[in-house]
């Protein structure tokens, strides 16, 4: 049996729409079926409609199909909107130009080439001919409209009504020569449906006999219309899936537009110093992917051919080797001179910040006006004027209230972090937004890092715990355990809450963890007495790039002889250089036979660019960073030592300044190490522990 | 543990709804992915329902899938108008725990449910 | 966004190292990338979270390296059973997720 062709392709759809007739005379046919294209072939055959097809609507809810020998161009007749609804019309009835010699056109062309009037033709005045309507049953020998029943050489004609001329061809043009594009047709809307060779292109929205992933609801801006030829992925001009099995795809012949002007809505926003949106009006001349390898050239085709060139992009200022986005990629790209390398991204240059949907943040994000409202962990934000009170207990001055619209993300606090906002949520009060900080904004959050300020104690008083010995002046040493064995240091700096790092906790399970505090040895051996066990509640980690973790317990620990909370600097503060400070852990030893018990090893504070020195330039710190070097070579902290504390003392008080986090090697002789700065996030870890609900005891 | 249930074999444009079914935790502190693997093919993100049940999607998921959390256990993936494109193995995956704030990743996976979309 | 991970396929002998890259067209938020490794019919298991951080159950022979918009897994001492497809999976603003389209790693 002969597969019957389907014949959708031949209509243009028109979704939630249907036709309403006005005048009563016109006929109408239903029927129930399944699919628009079962409508479709019996439209397209006329079977048994005692009518000429059209148009269609067909009803999804219903499941019904209803045939009409009018259009929405026909008189008597009003388009109307219908959920339910999408309009089928039959493109030859709708379409003013045509397609090879015009043996489809079913327009309404009515005049000669020289202007005449057409003969009707069902008349035999003024001229007699044999072309009646019955006769050429599907040729739509309709009125008097310009007509090619026989596909002849010069396209539509028809009788004149001038006695003196029997027949003469009707202007009509080709559809090539009405449509028309700029550059490479990226926004070309028009209604060419075959390719450059006339096979007739396959519907957007099928996927045969072609599969393809450009689904019209899945790119709703890209005009997938029907089976129109479009440029949805930056072809060099627009082109078609085919409705010949063996053809996939093919370009269409379509010419471009005399002027080439551009609508001003299909120009990108030009821009030369950053991006805006996916970056295709990017101008600049920024020419190296984003490691420093330089852009080939787009007019050459060494070291990788390519079809991307001037000539086929037409509009996408394709010059020298500057980053460009010629083709709707994610951001502006080039091919690379490195023969291994194809293609990068020249993902450097910086986003231009809008003033909605802002990406990045300046500073401390306090003048952030962006309209990002969800947290870090995918929380709504909750509306600023639902959180006053809140907000009034941890700031003591009057919030911008100008700046606290809606639930947008804010900084009212001057959070040293970024933007962040409440959630309603009770386990995760507040949280941080996930916006990061503009790429290359040097502003810095906190000032005069290498000059000693602010002072990091908060008192000046000596502090000695009932003159207890040496062992008691470690009680906020944590040891943290994964599935029953050490795996992390940690500093109580609060009963309920544990300072340690981020690369302690392999699992999110919170039952693998638990705390053990007032222990010496690393398997609580002799500490019996004076051993803690705490189960784990909750794992905040710290603002973006920190490497911190505030461990909430799940009950408070008991200060006594042995466990106690150690204090945190002020915040921003600086500790001068040459300061003595150690650090504690049950780590890797270097000995073979290691006894468990907790080590010291003495450092001391070095300014950020002497320590960049001793790491012979390689590392440039920040301000979230703390150097101290050792006084023994090859001492100081290594694996187990992790989110253990770097301590210090300042006016008889000791602080914890830094916490250890994986760096560049264990102990490496004249390399010191590199802490996680504590005071840098000493707002945050204070806000955490006034905001964070705990257990109490 | 987590496990996906609803996958068959659909004909092009009837909708169908995945359920991912979880024990051992709590829907109200963890967030949820939807993430599929067409054969042979690699794995793409769909969406998600978060912590608080609001909803994410990629790009090309709006408006073809929609993901509700419907209990404290159960999260769904409704595939409105299924085209054969979506033939796949469907994943549920947590992505965020309110019990570890700040560490967005998938650890905890269902084995998944094979969707077949065929005429 | 869009993760674009290289090569799509490598191959090394038993104790070999295998270095696999990931590409991001925009930034990835606090550097929440991870590595996943799948098995044929099996779920993906994480090795790294948070660009660097060790899984659970993951040797140290898996690291993870990189910030910002490039990435890196890196494979030492190469075991047969190492054999498997690895995906990268970035977090960005407005909380989307994205999967690089994965690297097959063949064992010889």
């Known amino acids: 049996q002969r597969k019957r062709r389907n014949t959708i392709h031949e209509f243009k759809k028109s979704a939630k729409t249907t036709l309403i007739k006005i005048d009563p005379a016109l006929k109408i046919k239903t029927k129930k079926v399944n699919t628009a294209d079962q409508c479709a072939n019996r439209c397209t055959r006329n079977k048994g409609l005692p009518f000429t097809c059209k148009a269609f609507v067909f009803d999804k809810a219903r499941k019904q199909c209803l045939w009409f020998p009018f259009n929405s161009m026909s008189s008597g007749v009003k388009k109307e909107f219908g959920h339910e609804f999408d309009l089928y019309e039959n493109k030859d009835y709708i379409r003013n130009c045509i397609i090879g010699k015009g043996r489809s056109y079913k327009g309404t062309v009515s005049i000669t080439k020289s202007g005449i009037k057409c003969q009707p033709w069902s008349s035999m005045i003024p001229h007699e001919h044999s072309f009646l309507p019955s006769s050429y049953r599907g040729k739509d020998l309709q009125e008097n409209y310009c007509r090619n029943p026989r596909g002849e050489e010069g396209g539509p004609w028809c009788f004149t009504s001038n006695p003196e001329v029997r027949y003469e061809v009707c202007d009509i043009p080709q559809c090539s020569e009405v449509e028309c594009m700029t550059c490479n047709g990226e926004s070309y809307r028009g209604l060419m449906d075959h390719t450059e060779s006339g096979k007739i292109c396959q519907r957007w929205d099928h996927q045969t006999p072609h599969r393809h992933k450009f689904l019209p609801e899945r790119y709703p801006d890209k005009g997938f219309d029907d089976n129109y030829c479009r440029n949805p992925d930056g072809q060099p001009r627009p082109w078609c899936y085919t409705l010949d099995p063996h053809t996939r795809w093919e370009y269409c012949a379509i010419k471009t537009c005399a002027d080439n002007t551009m609508n001003d809505t299909d120009v990108p926003l030009e821009t030369t110093e950053c991006i805006q949106g996916q970056g295709e009006g990017y101008r600049g001349t920024v020419n190296t992917i984003w490691n420093g390898i330089p852009c080939q050239r787009w007019d050459s085709q060494y070291p990788h051919e390519h079809d991307m060139t001037p000539e086929n992009f037409k509009c996408k200022d394709l010059r020298e080797n500057y980053c460009r986005n010629p083709d709707g990629s994610e951001s502006p790209w080039c091919f690379t001179t490195d023969p291994n390398i194809r293609v990068g991204y020249c993902s450097q240059i910086p986003n231009c910040d809008m003033s909605h949907g802002q990406d990045c943040y300046r500073g401390n994000g306090k003048n952030y006006m962006g309209n990002l409202s969800q947290t870090r962990s995918g929380l709504t934000c909750s509306m600023w004027d639902k959180n006053m009170e809140d907000l009034h207990r941890h700031i003591f001055w009057e919030p911008d209230a100008s700046k606290l619209n809606e639930n947008y993300c804010r900084n009212p606090d001057d959070d040293a972090h970024g933007p962040w906002c409440y959630t309603g949520n009770p386990l995760i009060p507040w949280d941080y937004c996930p916006i990061s900080r503009c790429e290359g904004d040097t502003t810095p959050t906190i000032v005069n890092l290498d000059h000693p300020v602010i002072s990091c104690a908060k008192t000046k008083q000596l502090r000695v715990v009932n003159g207890i010995p040496t062992r008691t002046n470690i009680g906020w040493m944590v040891s943290l355990r994964y599935r029953n064995k050490h795996i992390c240091g940690g500093s109580l700096i609060k009963e309920s809450w544990v300072l340690t790092a981020r690369q302690c906790f392999p699992s999110r399970d919170l039952k693998d963890y638990e705390a053990w505090l007032g222990i010496h040895d690393v398997h609580g051996r002799g500490d019996e007495k004076c051993k803690q066990v705490l189960n784990v509640s909750q794992l905040v980690y710290g603002p973006e790039g920190s490497d911190l973790v505030l461990m909430k317990l799940a009950r408070p620990a008991v200060l006594d002889d042995f466990v106690s909370t150690i204090d945190l600097p002020n915040y921003g503060c600086t500790i001068p250089e040459k300061t003595s400070c150690s650090v504690y852990g049950w780590g890797y030893t270097g000995l073979i036979n290691y006894d468990g018990l907790l080590r010291v090893a003495h450092l001391y504070i070095m300014g950020n660019e002497k320590c960049s020195q001793h790491h012979r330039g390689k590392v440039t710190l920040n301000e979230s960073e703390i150097c101290a070097g050792a006084e023994k070579i090859g001492s100081g902290p290594c694996e187990g030592d992790y989110g253990g504390p770097l301590v210090c003392e300042q006016h008889k008080m000791r602080m914890v300044l830094g916490v250890i986090v994986p760096g560049r090697g264990c102990a490496i002789p004249n390399r010191p190490g590199i802490f996680v700065r504590v005071a840098y996030y000493a707002k945050w870890i204070h806000k955490i522990i006034l905001t964070y609900k705990v257990p109490q005891s | 543990s987590v496990e996906e249930s609803g996958g068959r074999l659909v004909t092009p444009g009837t909708p169908l709804t995945l359920t991912c079914t979880v024990s051992g935790i709590d829907l109200n502190s963890n967030g949820m992915s939807w993430v599929r693997q067409a054969p042979g093919e690699g794995l793409e993100w769909i969406g998600a329902s978060s912590i608080d049940g609001t909803t994410y999607y990629t790009n090309w998921a709006k408006g073809r899938f929609t993901i509700s959390k419907t209990s404290s256990t159960t999260v769904d993936l409704k595939i409105t108008s299924p085209t054969t494109e979506d033939t796949a193995t469907y994943f549920c995956t947590r992505g965020e725990y309110a019990g570890v704030v700040g560490s967005n990743y998938f650890d905890l996976w269902g084995q998944g449910t094979l969707v077949t979309v065929s005429s | 966004q869009v993760l674009t991970q290289t090569p799509p396929s490598v191959s090394a002998v038993v104790g070999g190292t295998v270095t696999i890259n990931c590409q991001s067209s925009?930034?990835?938020?606090?550097?929440?990338l991870s590595w996943y490794q799948q098995k044929p019919g099996q779920t993906p298991k994480p090795l790294i979270y948070?660009?660097?951080s060790l899984a659970s159950g993951v040797p140290s022979r898996f690291k993870g390296s990189g910030s910002g918009t490039q990435f890196t897994l890196t494979i030492s001492d190469l075991e047969c059973d190492d054999a498997a497809s690895y995906y990268c999976a970035g977090y960005y603003s407005g909380h989307i997720y994205s999967f690089g389209g994965g690297t097959e790693v063949v064992v010889k």
């Open positions: 925009q930034r990835i938020y606090s550097n929440w």
């Open positions: 948070a660009a660097s």
